[in-house]
């Protein structure tokens, strides 16, 4: 997934999904970019991963993220988001054994190495938005979404009545 040495890349074969309890219903590899077409990239720095939001040079390959889709038992309030009234949740893994996680105390999005079953902080409710975009709502903190702040990913509290279409929480998935 990463264009830097020492970081395992995803091949076409996806993760082994034999986890205890909850299991994904589908998986796919995709690159993640913002509403304004900036790329979400990942870099290994001082033995920890940093997440950046940046304009990519033309010849640079986009980082890929493994999206694992899960069915949530919570009812879907949005037409087209769910199936049979279920919401979809996703986990996002840019490299093997590392997942994006919500740090609600710090209002940050971090990459952590963790074992399965994954913690609730690694799950995000998937919302289909206009302009072929999606948004990611924290399972652990409804109303809080992954968003872009100062060229980094952050957790952003959204007022449902006002800003659900706010550009800084909209993302595009592309193969």
């Amino acid at each position: 997934a990463f264009g830097i040495s020492g970081v395992p890349k995803y091949t076409r074969a996806l993760h082994d999904s034999s986890i205890t309890g909850i299991s994904p219903i589908t998986e796919s590899l995709a690159s993640l970019s913002t509403y304004n077409d900036q790329s979400i990239t990942f870099a290994l720095e001082d033995e920890s991963y940093e997440i950046y939001v940046e304009d990519l040079k033309k010849d640079k390959k986009k980082d890929k993220v493994l999206l694992s889709y899960y069915e949530s038992q919570h009812p879907s309030s949005e037409s087209g988001d769910g199936v049979d009234g279920k919401m979809l949740m996703v986990t996002l893994s840019p490299t093997k054994d590392f997942w994006l996680q919500a740090n609600n105390k710090e209002h940050s999005v971090e990459l952590h190495k963790c074992e399965k079953p994954l913690p609730d902080q690694a799950f995000f409710v998937l919302h289909n938005r206009s302009f072929n975009c999606v948004s990611f709502e924290c399972k652990t903190d409804p109303g809080v979404f992954i968003g872009v702040k100062d060229n980094h990913l952050a957790l952003i509290k959204v007022d449902y009545s006002e800003n659900l279409g706010s550009e800084n929480i909209l993302f595009k998935l592309s193969e």
């Epitope: 996806l14 999904s17 299991s23 796919s28 199936v83 979809l88």
Partner: antibody
Framework: EVQLVETGGGLIQPGGSLRLSCAAS????????MSWVRQAPGKGLEWVSA????????YYADSVKGRFTISRDNSKNTLYLQMNSLRAEDTAVYYC????????????????WGQGTLVTVSS | EIVLTQSPGTLSLSPGERATLSCRAS??????LSWYQQKPGQAPRLLIY???HRATGIPDRFSGSGSGTDFTLTISRLEPEDFAVYYC??????????FGGGTKVEIK
């Protein structure tokens, strides 16, 4: 009621063209990837083509690549399959199918199927 | 292209018996595999998705298992309405997506 209705099938000569349509109702069409699947008489299922919810990504089986074109009009809730340079081996019932989950991508199972439309390629 | 091989081609069983259908992929498809039932003159019907998740309204006698390259559909006790053709289908990352050749479950 969630429904898919295919139209446009019929008898066509080898080398001819045909356009199939699939009218969708009862769901948010643009949220779902769609596929065409065919079944030759007495044979098994063959995936033909798929398109993402936005229409930005399209996929084809090797057997139809360069001859068939999948498209969609989200404002009309309609899926299309333009079939050119038709061959006898394209004779089949053509089904349109909707993915199970509204994730816009094509990587999903098919939950809703139309009743199918028969395409016969023969001179 | 990922090839799905279903076995056996035909399964002759009696109502009440257990049916075990196999689907093997030529390379890993993760859990991106589904199972369908088709009866003559009808469109296919989704039974199992994500290798092991039962679709809404499907009786619990149907179950799916496996990941990677080896998958199984099990019908714990065959009912008269279960006699049909069953197909597996992979929708992994690289199209073309493919179906298996089918397994016909017939009355013995």
């Amino acid at each position: 009621e969630v429904q898919l209705v295919e139209t446009g099938g019929g008898l066509i000569q080898p080398g001819g063209s045909l356009r199939l349509s699939c009218a969708a109702s009862g769901f948010t069409f643009s949220s779902y990837a769609m596929s065409w699947v065919r079944q030759a008489p007495g044979k098994g299922l063959e995936w033909v083509s798929a398109i993402s919810g936005s229409g930005g990504s399209t996929y084809y089986a090797d057997s139809v690549k360069g001859r068939f074109t999948i498209s969609r009009d989200n404002s009309k809730n309609t899926l299309y399959l333009q079939m050119n340079s038709l061959r006898a081996e394209d004779t089949a019932v053509y089904y349109c199918a909707r993915t199970l989950h509204g994730i816009r991508a094509a990587y999903d199972a098919f939950i809703i199927w139309g009743q199918g439309t028969l395409v016969t390629v023969s001179s | 292209e990922i090839v799905l091989t279903q076995s056996p081609g035909t399964l002759s069983l009696s109502p009440g018996e257990r049916a075990t259908l196999s689907c093997r992929a030529s390379q890993s498809v993760g859990i991106n595999l589904s199972w369908y039932q088709q009866k003559p003159g009808q469109a296919p019907r989704l039974l199992i998705y994500g290798a092991s998740h039962r679709a809404t309204g499907i009786p619990d006698r149907f179950s799916g298992s496996g990941s990677g390259t080896d998958f199984t559909l099990t019908i714990s006790r065959l009912e008269p309405e279960d006699f049909a053709v069953y197909y597996c289908h992979q929708y992994s990352q690289s199209p073309p997506f493919t179906f298996g050749g089918g397994t016909k479950v017939e009355i013995k």
